[in-house]
Amino acid sequence: KFSKQSWGLENEALIVRCPRQGKPSYTVDWYYSQTNKSIPTQERNRVFASGQLLKFLPAAVADSGIYTCIVRSPTFNRTGYANVTIYKKQSDCNVPDYLMYSTVSGSEKNSKIYCPTIDLYNWTAPLEWFKNCQALQGSRYRAHKSFLVIDNVMTEDAGDYTCKFIHNENGANYSVTATRSFTVKDEQGFSLFPVIGAPAQNEIKEVEIGKNANLTCSACFGKGTQFLAAVLWQLNGTKITDFGEPRIQQEEGQNQSFSNGLACLDMVLRIADVKEEDLLLQYDCLALNLHGLRRHTVRLSRKNPIDHHSIYC
């Protein structure tokens, strides 16, 4: 349970996280399991420990083996094991199964491919993306943050996608590549009467006077592309733009998201410097499409600033 497989290619950077988490964690010590020899923390070493992370900069085939991490705190010491395998670089284009990360599925309208393990590294955009070893070019492909977006996905887009990025450590650059398979699902679209997921009908939202508050109006309208769909906020039955209170604004740009394959929209109402009079207003979340309109009403109530029993860091 507390062991994790990690792999990488020789001469590339590999960063591994300890599979045990501290609750809390004060220090983390790393050891070579076979020899019980401590792994240094000095960054001048090619292999060194940095808290929860074990860094191979760069990795060598001889680094393969099991590494022990001990998460120390006053109450308990927790032990985890990282099973690391470093492979030689392939001369041909084929990426063997043992170098593949989990397969992801996409559809015509949802085609994000995340670059595996990238959150462990100190990298800067943009990522380079390859499909079956060919650099991706053309307007259909967009490298966005840590993922690739493919517009108008077709069944031919299925295949093995490799992301390549540079990890920077103290001014030195190291290359990292990671590959995963992408499969394409056929998706039939449909439209239905709007379903508001948030807020709940007649919800009371607790706010602090003088603080900022956000209300999210979130609704789903069916599956696939929606011809007409919108979510918006009204104040006392009036559009936000017509209400004329500059402290209260709708967040621009309704992004169509696909949770569980559904086409959904979000609209955030931002209230700056909440005032007493804001508690008297009626806030309506409206969702509409060709089937009709649904409305959920929210009211604000004052919250005592630190009257919490479950504050956590």
Epitope: K23, Y26, T27, P74, T75, R78, I311
Partner: antibody
């Protein structure tokens, strides 16, 4: 909202034992340590011990070793503290408390009042 | 055991003014990792304690920024910049550096 729901007040006779419970909701029970704290007017807040629900490992304050026994049931997300051979010194409010990555006593139960009296 | 020392009462403060509460530890709470393991809690009348500050100077989630904390390895101060009526209660400092974890005896915030 993370909640730790503790069992109700107890009145027990000297020499008896009692088991207090602490049920966690809205967070992963095994992702936290559960700590127990005693509060009296005389001694204030005193740390009794902690349990790691994931492994069942325990740590105790030497003062309460042999007096308190901590256990946890992962299936019901509940931690228990058994207090044995009780005397009037055991009369107190007992709190369970959950930890996070940065804090040991990040959130607290509502407390259980224990009265030891004949 | 590390002893945490607090005064039983604060100087009475007027609402809207600032208040300071002190705490002293019998041993430095500075860990080799560079973190000072000093925590502040507030216990309002009839309620459980609630976390205010962790690792000496970090504000816990949901706590107003009127609260701040500073100190060395052994001497610590909790400051409330504009005291409000709901801030009344007993303020405890605690150390999480080593077992057994220990708490101060608490300082009651008094309003004039």
């Amino acid at each position: 909202q993370v909640q730790l729901q503790q069992s109700g007040a107890e009145l027990v006779r000297p020499g008896a034992s009692v088991t207090l419970s602490c049920k966690a909701s809205d967070y992963i029970f095994t992702d936290s340590e559960i700590h127990w704290v005693k509060q009296t007017l005389v001694h204030g807040l005193e740390w009794i011990g902690a349990i790691d629900p994931e492994t069942g490992d325990t740590a105790y304050n030497q003062k309460f070793k042999g007096k308190a026994t901590l256990t946890a049931d992962k299936s019901s997300s509940t931690a228990y503290m058994e207090l044995s051979s009780l005397t009037s010194e055991g009369s107190a409010v007992y709190y369970c408390s959950g930890s996070t990555t940065d804090c040991y006593f990040a959130y607290w139960g509502q407390g259980t009042t224990l009265t030891v009296s004949s | 055991d590390i002893v945490m020392t607090q005064a039983a009462f604060s100087n009475p403060v007027t609402l809207g003014t600032s208040a300071s509460i002190s705490c002293r530890s019998s041993k430095s709470l500075l860990h080799s990792n560079g973190i000072i393991y000093l925590y502040w809690y507030l216990q309002k009348p009839g309620q459980s304690p609630q976390l205010l500050i962790y690792q000496m100077s970090n504000l816990a989630s949901g706590v107003p920024d009127r609260f701040s904390s500073s100190g060395s390895g052994t001497d610590f101060t909790l400051r409330i910049s504009r005291v409000e009526a709901e801030d009344v209660g007993v303020y405890y400092c605690a150390q999480n550096l080593e077992l057994p974890f220990t708490f101060g005896s608490g300082t009651k915030l008094e309003i004039k």
